[in-house]
């Protein structure tokens, strides 16, 4: 049994880091493998993560962490029984993938303005809480070409757009994702999408 593709990990910078790797053949990850992890400076017992299958030869493990600070560095040991298959390290602050925003809501009752709001996925005491910026994706269910991205570079989790920038009388969907420049993170996953029917009064045209 050998590791074909070494573990790569990303952290949500709160409580979970996710590591993925590939073995050289079909593997029952949860029964055959264990990923042990511990902060490098500790002589305490390592934590054990039981991996799950992620495709035939792929494994994924969700490492639980009390909290995360920028200094944290973990040793990682991948074991198959008594055999050490791979040894490495992982610094969560250098591999951050933020949590996805939630509770995306479209408010359509504000005088021809669409107000989109969502929730910051971090509690106020987390470093990322005040460092997230967002991208909002709006698209038409009827017209695949009608697809747009709005970058929200301020901290408030909301976006206002004129309803007239979208077509009237058709349904749209929106979703939002987050990233943090301070840690050069990857983008989060998209939030679940929300749907609304766009309608507004066309301005009266005088000839």
């Amino acid at each position: 049994m050998k590791v074909l593709q070494e573990p790569t990990c990303v952290s949500d910078y709160m409580s979970i880091s996710t590591c993925e790797w590939k073995m050289n053949g079909p593997t029952n990850c949860s029964t055959e493998l264990r990923l042990l992890y511990q902060l490098v400076f500790l002589l305490s017992e390592a934590h054990t993560c039981i991996p799950e299958n992620n495709g035939g030869a792929g494994c994924v493990c969700h490492l639980l962490m009390d909290d995360v600070v920028s200094a944290d560095n973990y040793t990682l040991d991948l074991w198959a029984g008594q055999q050490l298959l791979w040894k490495g390290s992982f610094k969560p602050s250098e591999h951050v993938k933020p949590r996805a925003p939630g509770n995306l809501t479209v408010h359509t009752n504000v005088s021809d303005t669409l107000l989109l709001t969502w929730s910051n996925p971090y509690p106020p005491d987390n470093y990322l809480y005040n460092h997230l910026t967002y991208a909002v994706n709006i698209w038409s269910e009827n017209d695949p070409a009608d697809f747009r991205i709005y970058n929200v570079t301020y901290l408030e989790p909301s976006l206002r757009i004129a309803a007239s920038t979208l077509k009237s009388g058709i349904s749209y969907r929106a979703r939002v994702r987050a990233w943090a420049q301070c840690y050069n993170t990857t983008w989060s996953e998209w939030s679940p999408s929300t749907k609304w029917h766009n309608s507004y009064r066309e301005p009266f045209e005088q000839h």
Partner: antibody
Framework: QVQLVESGGGVVQPGRSLRLSCAAS????????MHWVRQAPGKGLEWVAV????????YYIDSVKGRFTISRDNSKNTLNLQMNSLRLEDTAVYYC??????????WGQGTLVTVSS | DIQMTQSPSSLSASVGDRVTITCRAS??????LAWFQQKPGKVPKSLIH???SLQSGVPSKFSGSGSGTDFTLTISSLQPEDFATYYC?????????FGQGTKVEIK
Amino acid sequence: QVQLVESGGGVVQPGRSLRLSCAASGFTFRSYGMHWVRQAPGKGLEWVAVISYDGSNKYYIDSVKGRFTISRDNSKNTLNLQMNSLRLEDTAVYYCAKEGRGGFDYWGQGTLVTVSS
Amino acid sequence: DIQMTQSPSSLSASVGDRVTITCRASQVINNYLAWFQQKPGKVPKSLIHAASSLQSGVPSKFSGSGSGTDFTLTISSLQPEDFATYYCQQYNSHPWTFGQGTKVEIK
């Protein structure tokens, strides 16, 4: 709640031996590295020794190497420090401490060791 | 071994003052630095870990900063209960080592 209670301190002559113990409760003792830290009267803190959760790794400050031995009994939730060939400069309050993500996260109240002729 | 050097070794300050204590490591310690407060006859109390992370229950008037080899503990507005001795400590590599301490006294 976490409790660490040191015992075994006292007055001893130079060259003699003393054994300190630390009784731990309120956490899974066998899972954590444990440390001894000391403080001479009116002086600063000095880290002395550490033992890994399973006893397989031990580290000491240079001034006590070969004289002090750190050990643990995970079945009794007890940390020990065997101190041989004691010197006047070993006089201090000895604290046991549990390690955590911030270095030390819990300390005992300490036990005083006085080396005097 | 990594040497930790604190400055000043003592300082006099008044209630309400902003106080800064510095700590220098003899080599890079990867931000594995803690700050402790100790009052006479008492057990050291942890204030900061990982150079800048406040321990649970510690008031926000305490803050830590720095990286690499140079670190700072700041008390934004000194209160009567803050007069004590403060120690930095590195836990990057064994032997873990403390600074010699900074005694904060009433002016």
